[in-house]
């Protein structure tokens, strides 16, 4: 099967790398614009320069292109706890991240929220907190994991999954009491 190419990809594939086919004259290959610039005017003819202009403040292009407009710089989303790691430049978008001792949770491909890394109180750190993953905790005996926190088995209701985790502990307590009475 031949992969389906969009019109733009079809046009580009006719020209060598780093060039694109002139939209009005398919016998002309124009040089693409460098990152940090955008296409102002197509090249007038073969071997002639493409008119590329630098992106204005607040916009960028991160790779060679023949875009008619630069892309708008992203803004870090304060309501999601995001902080700016590096500012937008003409050839690189804003880089957003989280504060120290926080991790990113991606709600979708292009939306993340910052949350505090779990401290594993009443448990031990099985895997340390990573940029995109919370700490993985292992709970001490008598505790179970709920929403990545170690909660006392005394808070375990029969209907919850914790019964499986807390049952051995409960049985142990009963066993100890029974053996102590003989």
């Amino acid at each position: 099967l031949v992969p389906h190419l969009g019109d733009r990809e079809k046009r580009d594939s006719v020209c060598p790398q780093g060039k694109y086919i002139h939209p009005q004259n398919n016998s002309i290959c124009c040089t693409k614009c460098h990152k940090g610039t955008y296409l102002y005017n197509d090249c007038p003819g073969p071997g002639q320069d493409t008119d590329c202009r630098e992106c204005e403040s607040g916009s960028f292009t991160a790779s060679e292109n023949h875009l008619r407009h630069c892309l708008s710089c992203s803004k870090c989303r304060k309501e999601m706890g995001q902080v700016e790691i590096s500012s937008c430049t003409v050839d690189r978008d804003t880089v957003c991240g989280c504060r120290k001792n926080q991790y990113r949770h991606y709600w979708s491909e292009n939306l993340f929220q910052c949350f505090n890394c779990s401290l594993c109180l009443n448990g031990t750190v099985h895997l340390s907190c990573q940029e995109k993953q919370n700490t993985v905790c292992t709970c001490h005996a008598g505790f179970f994991l709920r929403e990545n926190e170690c909660v006392s088995c005394s808070n375990c209701k029969k209907s919850l999954e914790c019964t499986k985790l807390c049952l051995p502990q409960i049985e142990n307590v009963k066993g100890t009491e029974d053996s102590g009475t003989t």
Partner: nanobody
Amino acid sequence: EVQLLESGGGLVQPGGSLRLSCAASGFTFAHETMVWVRQAPGRGLEWVSHIPSDGQDPFYADSVKGRFTISRDNSKNTLYLQMNSLRAEDTAVYYCALLPKRGPWFDYWGQGTLVTVSS
């Protein structure tokens, strides 16, 4: 006690419009970022849109950008979702929720309102 009550769902033809509302109580609505999520039959939760407390710079999922508009009226403690140019793939139960704070789960969300897009 936090309460979120969605309304406005229903059956609509492709290309049609609906406006969902979410009445909030039990917390200071004007201080909270509010979220619309949806769940299509047999699918997981999908983040649709959210709006910060001041109503500025809302976020939209790529799948709804240019068709849906989120808004809020802090004086009425109400969140809205205007849905235009509806498609069959927008069929889902729509929930409003408070932006999570402690971790990546929803502590507070409504019972949902069903939107069915079909001819």
